[in-house]
Amino acid sequence: KGMHAAQPAVVLASSRGVASFVCEYGSSGNAAEVRVTMLRQAGSQMTEVCAATYTVEDELAFLDDSTCTGTSSGNKVNLTIQGLRAMGTGLYICKVELMYPPPYYVGMGNGTQIYVIDPEPCPDSD
């Protein structure tokens, strides 16, 4: 079943290569287990950046080695991507799946264009 997901159109990463935005999905109602996946679209190719499953009982938990962190509150997920470089500029799409209990719902946002500008190297000083 389809579900609406919303995310900001544009986000500028910090000089440290960190970008944060909120992904909001249609009310989860009685959804107990939700899976959030961050996808990066480059041209016609879509790659998974990170994913996490959380329950209404627990906080959002990404894998320890993930480039993402996040917190959940109701039907909003605050996502943070770290370690971004200029080549990481692109469209980042938030996908939300209401996994349990049935019925299964899935929603995808229109994507957030993240702009990453690598900091200029500091000039050598004598």
Epitope: R35, T55, M99, Y100, P101
Partner: antibody
């Protein structure tokens, strides 16, 4: 703290109707499904079904389709189980239970006696 | 419907003994998302059931570590490493993977 408080014991005759209530407190009622479980005297637990407290949509196990109805009074954070045209085999204790990915919270149970 | 079969029906034990209860499902209870919603509950006389284990092997908060759950697919086990008096009662397994969700028939843990 989170509580599910059920209505008191009921004594009914065959053919009558009973409505059992389950009042929730200590959490957002519409965030969690409410399930109903039957336990006949000296028997095990039997899952009757559940109601989505957000949409109001009920799901019934096959044995509980027809005479049984789950309903809600969301403003009062209360779920109801109604049994129509009571039969002797309906004599049991009925539990409500809040489900997420498990049942951590249960009502105390409502004992229904059906006797002519 | 998924039939949950528990064995034994009755389990007489001495306090301090290990107890093991088996639960078999008539088909795999792995849900479409890869999780197995298999739980264990303890019901004492005149009381509501209490959650012990969820998703096969996760102990619910406040449940002593003498309780452990294991298994996969169709075969599941609840172990109590050292039975205490407060552990006596009827144990039920439950599957929440396939609607209609179903309970096992129960295993009565009693003193030998």
């Amino acid at each position: 703290q989170i509580q599910l408080v059920q209505s008191g014991p009921e004594l009914k005759k065959p053919g009558e109707t009973v409505k059992i209530s389950c009042k929730a407190s200590g959490y957002t009622f519409t965030n969690y499904g409410m399930n109903w479980v039957k336990q006949a005297p000296g028997k095990g637990l039997k899952w009757m079904g559940w109601i989505n407290t957000y949409t109001g949509e009920p799901t019934y196990a096959d044995d509980f389709k027809g005479r049984f109805a789950f309903s809600l009074e969301t403003s009062a954070s209360t779920a109801y189980l109604q049994i129509n045209n009571l039969k002797n085999e309906d004599m049991a204790t009925y539990f409500c239970a809040r489900r997420s990915i498990y049942y951590p919270y249960w009502g105390q149970g409502t004992t229904l006696t059906v006797s002519s | 419907d998924v039939l949950m079969t528990q064995t034994p029906l009755s389990l007489p034990v001495s306090l301090g003994d290990q107890a093991s209860i088996s639960c078999r499902s008539s088909q795999s209870i792995v849900y479409s998302n890869g999780n197995t919603y298999l739980e264990w509950y303890l019901q004492k006389p005149g009381q509501s059931p209490k959650l012990l284990i969820y998703k096969v092997s996760n102990r619910f908060s406040g449940v002593p570590d003498r309780f452990s759950g294991s298994g996969s697919g169709t075969d599941f086990t609840l172990k109590i490493s050292r039975v205490e008096a407060e552990d006596l009662g009827v144990y039920y397994c439950f599957q929440g993977s396939h609607v209609p969700w179903t309970f096992g028939g129960g295993t009565k843990l009693e003193i030998k």
